[in-house]
């Protein structure tokens, strides 16, 4: 070994080395929450940059760069460090046009933290162990959330657009010149039937148990789905969409409620299999993947 | 295509009866309202009754007590006429808001028209 790669061993060795890095890590992520940070701290941005390119060149020095097996750029933790660095010269030296949208991986320079601190590494790596487990456990999720948003798109495609309308139109009027002229809240409101303090029309459907529309109103399927066009079955993203929100119990049982109203509580049973099937039993598989990973990883 | 074919129409003296029918031809999802109008020569077209599937019906005030509107299980809607007068000549039309699939939305079709004649 040269001297030169003996004293970086020594000093990337050494524990006083490990404290500096984690103190500048640390005192670069107080900087890095200033909202208007004062003009002297660019010097200080330099510091940093200069620490964290010495803390490189040190072990870059020590391990080699990359042609051994344990040379800098084999542990991943290091592609961290070296992205860092390359971006802060990138920010500062190259004029590349939007610079706010790199200045954003700074922000990685927090990650930094993980690798110096040893518990830390160990989680995040347990944690890493874990989405590689999960693989199986998310195709099969995707593909049951998939089959199900299927079967929701054959039953459900349209039905949420049902609303319930006024009777009363005028001699000349047809539902497609209303809908052409409707155009605030206001407007709607004076044609659709609302419930207080309700953003959408009243749901309703066509078969004899799903939600009937009050005296004077008539059940049409036209204009929007409700939530401002967001819930709905009418295709299969948004299908997947709705199954998802069900499986991670988002506000279900109002997404329940508006389908079951426009479709019939005869579908009830569509959700109740959806909720054992997605919410109680793959939520519960994704945790137990996890929670073995972890397990595994503390041994 | 979705059509709508009245039918019924004719003279008729005064005091007389007529029966008008309008069936949907085609195919047809849903059938929401089922509505009567009538132009009269030289002026607008009014409304003169509706059904609806819940059963709500309701009639212009100048045929209320005469005419009466009803619809069977198929895609039919009748119009039953009763003691008419000359002022009820007019051209009368069929108007359905329906559903031709249960993938289209809501919309509103005409019939052709039925000519009631009211004289002596």
């Known amino acids: 070994f040269s001297p030169l790669r003996r004293i970086s061993i020594k000093i990337l060795v050494h524990s006083l080395f490990s404290m500096l890095i984690m103190c500048t890590i640390l005192t670069n992520c107080i900087f890095m929450t200033m909202n208007n940070p004062p003009d002297w701290t660019k010097n200080v941005e330099y510091t940093f940059t200069g620490i964290y390119t010495f803390e490189s060149l040190v072990k870059i020095l020590a391990r080699g760069f990359c042609v051994g097996e344990f040379t800098f750029l084999r542990d991943p933790w290091n592609w961290l460090d070296f992205v860092v660095i390359v971006f802060a010269y990138l920010t500062e030296f190259v004029n590349l046009g939007n610079v706010s949208a790199l200045r954003t991986f700074r922000v990685l320079r927090a990650l930094k933290t993980i690798s110096v601190i040893p518990g830390l590494k160990t989680i995040v790596g347990a944690l890493i162990q874990s989405v590689k487990k999960l693989s199986d456990v998310m195709i099969l999720t995707v593909f049951c959330l998939s089959v199900f948003a299927l079967i929701g798109l054959q039953l459900f495609m349209g039905n949420l657009k049902h609303k319930c309308f006024r009777n009363s139109l005028e001699n000349n009027e047809t539902l497609e010149s209303i809908m052409n002229t409707l155009e605030s809240e206001e407007d709607f409101r004076k044609y659709f039937y609302y419930l207080e303090g309700s953003k959408d029309a009243l749901l309703c459907g066509f078969s004899t148990d799903s939600g009937q529309c009050p005296e004077g109103y008539t059940c049409v399927k036209i204009g929007r789905n409700p939530d401002y066009g967001y819930t709905s079955f009418d295709t299969f993203s948004w299908a997947f969409l709705a199954l998802f929100r069900l499986m991670t119990q988002d506000y279900w049982e109002n997404l329940y409620q508006q389908t079951l109203r426009a479709a019939g509580k005869t579908y009830m049973i569509f959700f109740v299999v959806v909720i054992f099937l997605g919410s109680f039993y793959l939520i519960n598989l994704i945790l137990a993947v996890v929670a073995m990973a972890y397990e595994e990883q503390n041994q | 295509e979705v059509q709508l074919v009245e039918s019924g129409g004719g003279v008729v003296q005064p005091g007389g009866s007529l029966r008008l029918s309008c069936a949907a031809s085609?195919?047809?999802?849903?059938?929401?309202?089922m509505a009567w109008y009538r132009q009269a020569p030289g002026k607008q077209r009014e409304l003169v009754a509706y059904?609806?599937?819940?059963?709500?019906i309701s009639y212009a005030d100048s045929v209320k007590g005469r005419f009466t509107i009803s619809r069977d299980r198929s895609k039919r809607v009748y119009l039953q006429m009763n003691s008419l007068r000359p002022e009820d000549t007019a051209l009368y039309y069929c108007?359905?808001?329906?559903?031709?699939?249960?993938?289209?939305?809501?919309?509103?079709?005409w019939g052709q028209g039925t000519l009631v004649t009211v004289s002596s």
């Open positions: 085609g195919p047809v999802f849903n059938i929401n309202r």
């Open positions: 059904v609806t599937p819940t059963g709500d």
């Open positions: 108007r359905a808001l329906l559903q031709p699939d249960r993938y289209s939305n809501t919309r509103t079709y």
